[in-house]
Interface confidence: medium
């Protein structure tokens, strides 16, 4: 399917105003620095040449590669030393060393401001002198904050983001209205991006095949009835769309997953029972409800998996005929009878017996030797169960704030070289598992939980990849994808971590402590209570809780005091000598 | 969907022999049983050879044919093959290849999902 152009091709699959969008995301994701008119400018010129190619497809350039026109167009900011540093060394490579250069240089934490949302009367004053750049900008901010954002679903983010404005300024109580459907998105926006993280970490750090047995497991759960042939065409077809839009083909991604959306639309037979609602919606959401469409249900006469991968005499030779096959097929109907199951644990199972074939093909007698494969996967399974339990009842008896506190103590005393704020970060995101997964049913909290650890373990991954600190955390970032949770989990207290000097500012607070949210003043007494750890890594929890409640009646007193910045100067080192003290 | 095309019939005398292939358009092809069924005028449609997926070790015949007919598979090109030597009049019928996704093996006509066109065979006396 080759194209005299490529830019013209694309311009036309996608319409305008998608490729517009899409490649406002990429030089945004490329360069997260720039401010939003530089990058305006430089999409409007892409665009305006991309029009030229699609009234003639030999006029010249146009028959150059996607990546050479983008990068040609991104090593023309003339601000890119000052602003980037070694990233302009990028621009002196040729392609695709280039793109590859410009994907190493993007920053997983950049060095932005926090969005600060303006009053509702200001936002939809903005919304309607300009709708056009008011929408631009959005996907401006969110794209140079989340570089590996996926861009088809930025772009059905912004469409929910057009639609709260255009109800909600029309509304008698605007703030009403808009607030909650912000909260939401903003929400929604950040799980959507840690997600899409650890998919282009699969890809990158582990391969696609590492993609693929994620997809086999999760298509295999959503769509029991399809056959494996099925679901390895969709795997295939899926593989593409997220190794082009981790590798920064923003174009080349969108355009695939909607003919992968129009492909399952039109085989939906063959496919699920459940995607029938989602395909009588526009594109954006249409894709979107795909991605998240529920479980179908299991066939009602599915047999034992025993007789075909443990009993069967041909289980070495149907191996060696075709390995990735064969555990492709095992995985797929393992998952198939096991919604309920994290994808994690499948691919540990599908590891396992992986690793038992390995070692029992080569055996004297490789029957006898896989005849008790399926006990071994007992263990295995218990300890995601087990771990979902005791975590769960932990957080019923706490709460949201209390369980994160215990998980960030738990995590600090793992590995206490990694920053402060990553530390809370990581831990806060851990701790709203509880509140995500506990209340489902059974069948539905190990994968609700696993799979979601997972996300966050690998933002955690991705932000020590940036500044390396702990051995013990490489380890479990780098030896297996699927073993990192419960790499994490088995990890104790670090012996050989050197306590870190107490230092008296770190503890010391200020009037402001109390005209911060609800949400800002819990992340402030959480990175005082991850530093106290880092000072006494072996405080009993007793301690630790003794401490904290000081500390919470310590700023309540004070915010409530007439002369607040009076009482925190006289409070404040008390507090701290009583800390010592308490934690001596 | 699987598509499955059958070549090789045609007329024979008795005692002589035919190659029927039945090649399919699934990439998957390594995941499926493969049969082959025939019916002959006014009669049932019955069982005649099943190979098992991947490597296709284990094979099975019905009694009627055993000795005489092979039943074998190239993965690599996605097709089946049904060897079929010392033929007799009786073995007269079309012949249709089936693919099953159920088992990794089936004589049961009821376990494959999709069926080809078939390909007629005729032995003459």
């Known amino acids: 399917d080759t194209h005299k152009s490529e830019v013209a091709h694309r311009f036309k699959d996608l319409g305008e105003e998608h490729f517009k969008g899409l490649v406002l995301v990429a030089f945004s994701q490329y360069l997260q620095q720039c401010p939003f008119e530089e990058h305006v400018k430089l999409v409007n010129e892409v665009t305006e040449f991309a029009k030229t190619c699609v009234a003639d497809e030999s006029a010249e350039n146009c028959d150059k590669s996607l990546h050479t026109l983008f990068g040609d167009k991104l090593c023309t900011v003339a601000t890119l030393r000052e602003t980037y540093g070694e990233m302009a060394d990028c621009c002196a490579k040729q392609e695709p060393e280039r793109n590859e250069c410009f994907l190493q240089h993007k920053d997983d934490n950049p060095n932005l401001p926090p969005l600060v949302r303006p009053e509702v009367d200001v936002m939809c004053t903005a919304f309607h002198d300009n709708e056009a750049t008011f929408l631009k900008k959005y996907l401006y901010e969110v794209a140079r904050r989340h570089p590996y954002f996926y861009a088809p679903e930025l772009l059905f983010f912004a469409a929910r983001y057009k639609a709260a404005f255009a109800e909600c300024c029309q509304a008698a109580d605007k703030a009403a209205c808009l607030l909650p459907k912000l909260d939401e998105l903003r929400d929604e926006g950040k799980a959507s991006s840690a997600k899409q993280r650890l998919k282009c970490a699969s890809l990158q750090k582990f391969g696609d095949r590492a993609f693929k047995a994620w997809a086999v497991a999760r298509l295999s759960q959503k769509f029991p009835k399809a056959e494996f042939a099925e679901v390895s065409k969709l795997v295939t077809d899926l593989t593409k769309v997220h190794t082009e839009c981790c590798h920064g083909d923003l174009l080349e991604c969108a355009d695939d997953r909607a003919d992968l959306a129009k492909y399952m639309c039109e085989n939906q037979d063959s496919i699920s029972s459940k995607l029938k609602e989602c395909c009588d919606k526009p594109l954006l959401e249409k894709s979107h409800c795909l991605a998240e469409v529920e479980n179908d249900e299991m066939p009602a006469d599915l047999p034992s998996l025993a007789a075909d991968y443990v009993e069967s005499k041909d289980v070495c030779k149907n191996y060696a005929e075709a390995k990735d096959v064969f555990l492709g097929m095992f995985l797929y109907e393992y998952a198939r009878r096991h919604p309920d199951y994290s994808v994690m644990l499948l691919l540990r199972l599908a590891k396992a017996y992986e690793a038992t074939l390995e070692k029992c093909c080569a055996a004297a007698d490789p029957h006898e030797c896989y005849a008790k494969v399926f006990d071994e996967f007992q263990p295995l399974v218990e300890e995601p169960q087990n771990l979902v339990k005791q975590n769960c009842e932990l957080f019923e008896q706490l709460g949201e704030y209390k369980f994160q506190n215990a998980l960030l103590v738990r995590y600090t005393k793992k590995v206490p070289q990694v920053s402060t704020p990553t530390l809370v970060e990581v831990s806060r995101n851990l701790g709203k598992v509880g509140a995500k997964c506990c209340k489902l049913p059974e069948a539905k909290r190990m994968p609700c939980a696993e799979d979601y650890l997972s996300v966050v373990l690998n933002r955690l991954c991705v932000l020590h990849e940036k500044t390396p600190v702990s051995e013990k955390v490489t380890k479990c970032c780098t030896e297996s994808l699927v073993n990192r949770r419960p790499c994490f989990s088995a990890l104790e207290l670090d012996e050989a971590y050197v306590p870190k000097a107490f230092n008296a500012e770190t503890f010391t607070f200020h009037a402001d402590m109390c005209t911060l949210s609800e949400k800002e003043k819990q992340v402030k007494k959480q990175t005082a209570l991850v530093e106290l750890v880092k000072h006494k890594p072996k405080a009993t929890k007793e301690q630790l809780k003794g401490v904290m409640d000081n500390f919470a009646a310590f700023v309540e007193k004070c915010c409530k005091a007439d002369d607040k910045e009076a009482c925190f100067a006289e409070e404040g080192p008390k507090f701290v000598a009583a800390s010592q003290a308490a934690l001596a | 969907e699987v598509q499955l095309v059958e070549s090789g019939g045609g007329l024979v005398q008795a005692g002589g022999s035919l190659r029927l292939s039945c090649t399919a358009s699934r990439r998957a092809f390594i995941g499926y049983a493969m049969g082959w069924f025939r019916q002959a005028p006014g009669k049932e449609r019955e069982f005649v050879a099943a190979?098992?997926?991947?490597?296709?070790?284990?094979?099975d015949y019905a009694d009627s044919v055993k000795g005489r007919f092979t039943i074998s598979r190239d993965n690599a090109k996605n097709t089946v093959y049904l060897q079929m030597n010392g033929l007799k009049p009786e073995d007269t019928a079309v012949y249709v290849c089936?693919?099953?996704?159920?088992?990794?093996?089936?004589?049961?006509?009821?376990?494959?999902?999709?069926w080809g066109q078939g390909t007629q065979v005729t032995v003459s006396s």
């Open positions: 089936a693919a099953s996704s159920a088992r990794p093996m089936s004589g049961r006509s009821d376990e494959y999902h999709y």
């Open positions: 190979i098992s997926w991947f490597a296709g070790d284990t094979t």
